[in-house]
């Protein structure tokens, strides 16, 4: 029983991660699998035989870099449920050819500790005791959304806002991993997927400022409030 090298990968909720795996010399099926709690088996997530596990469809890609002796698996639109133990491997039997263990932890951005981070000071001459004489502030209920482009700044009429009830579809976030130079990657995501995603994005583009605000609000909340545990308040 050989001990596998282990790597830990941190991912941000809604973001993406790239898992780096060793690539064997011989031309053989390679894969990323996920260890199933309880059963001890490792279920294929993605492999070079064009298999993609259902819950990862449209958000996982596998690219090989033979000259670098590695392959990369990118997972986008991360959710809490993606946290877990994965393994890279090679060979026809997913359970047998593991080369590296990968622990993925998906979380909201880490909130700096209260004690550790010095609080930035406001200008010394802006005296806070003066600030303290304030009555309760009542805000206006009227708000306006504006889309600003380099060419123009157009105003739209005020929109009535209520809590978001729209079904949200996230656009896949661009990967932060830098690509590996020197190789043209071989991608094993079915070729139609990219065009389908782009067509879908066209269809799903928010039609109104209100929808746009709520769609984005949902995503921001997922980033900031989505997977906090204990005291890791994100924001």
């Amino acid at each position: 029983l050989r001990i596998l090298p282990e790597v830990k990968v941190e991912g941000e909720l809604g973001g993406s991660v790239t898992i780096k795996c060793p690539l064997p010399e011989m031309h053989v099926r390679i894969y990323l699998c996920r260890e199933m709690a309880g059963s001890g088996t490792c279920g294929t997530v993605v492999s070079t035989t064009n298999f993609i596990k259902a819950e990862y469809k449209g958000r996982v890609t596998l690219k090989q870099y033979p000259r670098k002796n590695l392959f990369l698996v990118e997972v986008t639109q991360l959710t809490e449920s993606d946290s877990g133990v994965y393994a890279c491997g090679a060979g026809m039997n997913t359970d047998r050819g593991k080369t590296q263990k990968v622990t993925l932890n998906v979380h909201s951005e880490y909130e700096p500790s209260w004690e550790e981070q010095p609080m930035p000071e406001t200008p010394k001459w802006f005296h806070l005791p003066y600030l303290f004489q304030m009555p309760a502030y009542a805000s206006s209920s009227k708000f306006v959304t504006r889309v600003t482009t380099p060419a123009q700044r157009g105003k739209v009429p005020p929109v009535h806002h209520s809590s978001p009830t729209t079904q949200i579809t996230h656009r896949p976030r661009v990967s932060r991993a830098s690509s590996v130079a020197g190789d043209k990657p071989r991608t094993f995501l079915p070729s139609t997927t990219a065009s389908k995603i782009s067509a879908l994005e066209g269809l799903l583009k928010p039609q109104t400022p209100s929808y746009n605000h709520h769609t984005r609000l949902h995503r921001q909340r997922a980033l900031d409030y989505g997977s906090q545990s204990g005291r890791e308040g994100q924001g």
Partner: antibody, heavy 114, light 111 residues
Framework: QVQLQQPGAELVRPGSSVKLSCKAS????????LHWVKQRPIQGLEWIGY????????HYNQNFKDKATLTVDKSSSTAYMQLSSLTSEDSAVYYC???????WGQGTLVTVSA | DVVMTQTPLTLSVTIGQPASISCKSS???????????LNWLLQRPGQSPKRLIY???KLDSGVPDRFTGSGSGTDFTLKISRVEAEDLGVYYC????????FGGGTKLEIK
């Protein structure tokens, strides 16, 4: 760590405009909305609006729609707020803060005075 | 209008004693996603505000457990079990369910 850097103070003339900056670091700038908040003596904290740095979509409190203009420069990870037609009522500390107000800049004191 | 009303305006407390601040909203802050976006900030003298509590009762990293947040719907409370000198400043509640609104602030001063 996440930081939002703002200049300490701006002294401006009535009727003019001022552009305040907020330089973000320690996180992916385009992933998180940035809010702007006004703090005046007596009035407390007042939400001005937010900008989504990924594509500059903005959302304003109606009270500030003709006063404030929010923009970003992605290349320098900096957000800006321009305040126009300044009066003494605009004298305040202006903060930028990230989406759920867990991270704040140190604030810029704007003083409107002849 | 979502108006956030905080009471009292000023709170004078002896070190080691408990303190309680109330925050009432003019409409329910329970969102359609099942979460209540009611949060608390502390602005210490000469500093920027700092978030203490989010989603009614969750403490931010590093916030001492003498702070507790509670409430639902429209009525919320921030409690400090034993006030310490570093707790002085102005406490604000704010809501993020219906855009963003801040309460008027409660100044905590040490007797």
């Amino acid at each position: 760590q996440v930081q939002l850097q703002q200049p300490g103070a701006e002294l401006v003339r009535p009727g003019s405009s001022v552009k305040l900056s907020c330089k973000a670091s320690g996180y992916t700038f385009t992933n998180h909305w940035l809010h702007w908040v006004k703090q005046r003596p007596i009035q407390g904290l007042e939400w001005i609006g937010y900008i989504d740095p990924s594509d500059s979509l903005t959302h304003y409190n109606q009270n500030f729609k003709d006063k404030a203009t929010l923009t970003v420069d992605k290349s320098s990870s900096t957000a800006y707020m321009q305040l126009s037609s300044l009066t003494s009522e605009d004298s305040a500390v202006y903060y930028c803060a990230r989406f759920s107000f867990a991270y704040w800049g140190q604030g810029t004191l704007v003083t409107v005075s002849a | 209008d979502v108006v956030m009303t905080q009471t009292p305006l000023t709170l004078s407390v002896t070190i080691g004693q408990p303190a309680s601040i109330s925050c009432k909203s003019s409409q329910s802050l329970l969102d359609s996603d099942g979460k209540t976006y009611l949060n608390w900030l502390l602005q210490r003298p000469g500093q920027s505000p700092k978030r203490l509590i989010y989603l009614v009762s969750k403490l931010d990293s590093g916030v001492p457990d003498r702070f507790t947040g509670s409430g639902s719907g429209t009525d919320f409370t921030l409690k400090i079990s034993r006030v310490e000198a570093e707790d002085l400043g102005v406490y604000y509640c704010w809501q993020g369910t219906h855009l963003w609104t801040f309460g008027g602030g409660t100044k905590l001063e040490i007797k």
